[in-house]
C-alpha cells in the first residue's frame, strides 16, 4: 500500500465486535476483500467480508462472539490483516497490530425514556449497551436537545463527566415538541472515540396552566 492511498481504521465496542473500514483510492468497487483478526493470546480467529460503503471504501464487522461476551481484555493485541483476492490467491494489503482497549467506540445508548415531564423540565433516562464491566464507572456522556426551528448541529452539547444515565433538562418551553440524543465514551484509550448518537427520543413539554404566569 502506498502512502496516502489507503487507510485502515478499526474500533472495538468493548465486548465482542471490532468494526473496520478500509479505503483505497483507485481500487475497483467489485474487488473481493476481507479482514482477518488473529489475537495474540486467544485460540480463536475471525474473518469478515468487506462490503462497499462508498466509491473507495469498504466496511465490515468482526463478530467475536455473543454480543455481551467479553472476548478481549486490556492486555490483548489483535493482528488485523486486509486481504484482497487477486485471481486465485489472496494478497495482503495491510497489517496492523491493534490494541482493542486503546481503540474503543461503544454502541449507542439505548432504551431512552421520559421519566417525568413538566412544563419547563423533562427528566430522561437511558441505558448503555454491550459495554464492558471493566469500565466500572469510567464513562462520560454527551447529550443534545433539538429545539423547534433548529438543527442537531446547532444544538448545544451537554457534558456529563461521570457515569450518569439520566439527565434533567430545564428551561424548556411549555407545550413544545423536542427531540433528545445521547452518546457515550470510555475515559481510556489512545484512539477511543464517541459512540454514535442514540436514536432520538421525541417528547413534548406540558402546556402551561391557563391563567398562570409562565
Amino acid at each position: 500500500a502506498v502512502n496516502g492511498t489507503s487507510q485502515f481504521t478499526c474500533f472495538y465496542n468493548s465486548r465482542a465486535n471490532i468494526s473496520c473500514v478500509w479505503s483505497q483510492d483507485g481500487a475497483l468497487q467489485d474487488t473481493s476483500c476481507q479482514v482477518h483478526a488473529w489475537p495474540d493470546r486467544r485460540r480463536w480467529n475471525q474473518t469478515c467480508e468487506l462490503l462497499p460503503v462508498s466509491q473507495a471504501s469498504w466496511a465490515c464487522n468482526l463478530i467475536l462472539g455473543a454480543p455481551d461476551s467479553q472476548k478481549l481484555t486490556t492486555v490483548d493485541i489483535v493482528t488485523l490483516r486486509v486481504l484482497c483476492r487477486e485471481g486465485v490467491r489472496w494478497r495482503v494489503m495491510a497489517i496492523q497490530d491493534f490494541k482493542p482497549f486503546e481503540n474503543l467506540r461503544l454502541m449507542a445508548p439505548i432504551s431512552l425514556q421520559v421519566v417525568h415531564v413538566e412544563t419547563h423540565r423533562c427528566n430522561i433516562s437511558w441505558e448503555i449497551s454491550q459495554a464492558s464491566h471493566y469500565f466500572e464507572r469510567h464513562l462520560e456522556f454527551e447529550a443534545r436537545t433539538l429545539s423547534p426551528g433548529h438543527t442537531w448541529e446547532e444544538a448545544p452539547l451537554l457534558t456529563l463527566k461521570q457515569k450518569q444515565e439520566w439527565i434533567c433538562l430545564e428551561t424548556l418551553t411549555p407545550d413544545t415538541q423536542y427531540e433528545f440524543q445521547v452518546r457515550v465514551k470510555p475515559l481510556q484509550g489512545e484512539f477511543t472515540t464517541w459512540s454514535p448518537w442514540s436514536q432520538p427520543l421525541a417528547f413534548r413539554t406540558k402546556p402551561a396552566a391557563l391563567g398562570k404566569d409562565t
Partner: nanobody
Framework: EVQLVESGGGLVQAGASLELSCAAS????????MGWFRQAPGKEREFVAA????????MYAVSTEGRFSCSRDNAKNTVNLLIKNLKPEDTAVYYC????????????????????WGQGTQVTVSS
C-alpha cells in the same frame, strides 16, 4: 528533541530470532510516533513498521509476513523490533525514526514523514 540510538544487530543464522532496540533520550518520548525502516545494500530505504504515540496501533509492511513485531515502552523511552525466522533477505541496516507530527496508525507512512533518525544497526543473516 529526542536522540535515537539503535542496538541489537549482528550476524545471525537464518531461522533465528533477533530483537532490535531503540533508546530515545533528550525529549518527551511519548509525544513521538516511532518507526523502523531498513536499507539493504544497493537498495532504497524501505518501511518496516510504525507505531503511534501510545502504541495503540502499529502498522507493518506487508512484506514482513507477520514475522516482525514492534512494541514501545514509554516508561523506558524505548521501541523494540522483534524479527522471527530471519531470512537472508532481511540483511540490511535497520533504522529507528521518530515523527513529531501526529500519526494515527491507519496508513503506511513514508520515510519523509519522519524527522529524527538513529545511526542504524547492521543485521546480517547467513544461510
Amino acid at each position: 528533541e529526542v536522540q535515537l540510538v539503535e542496538s541489537g544487530g549482528g550476524l545471525v543464522q537464518a531461522g533465528a530470532s533477533l530483537e532490535l532496540s531503540c533508546a530515545a533520550s533528550g525529549g518527551t518520548f511519548s509525544s513521538y510516533a516511532m518507526g523502523w525502516f531498513r536499507q539493504a545494500p544497493g537498495k532504497e530505504r524501505e518501511f518496516v513498521a510504525a507505531t503511534t504515540r501510545g502504541g495503540g496501533r502499529t502498522m507493518y509492511a506487508v512484506s514482513t509476513e507477520g514475522r516482525f513485531s514492534c512494541s514501545r515502552d514509554n516508561a523506558k523511552n524505548t521501541v523494540n523490533l522483534l524479527i522471527k525466522n530471519l531470512k537472508p533477505e532481511d540483511t540490511a541496516v535497520y533504522y529507528c525514526a521518530a515523527r513529531t507530527s501526529y500519526y494515527d496508525g491507519t496508513y503506511y507512512p513514508a520515510s519523509s514523514d519522519f524527522d529524527i533518525w538513529g545511526q542504524g544497526t547492521q543485521v546480517t543473516v547467513s544461510s
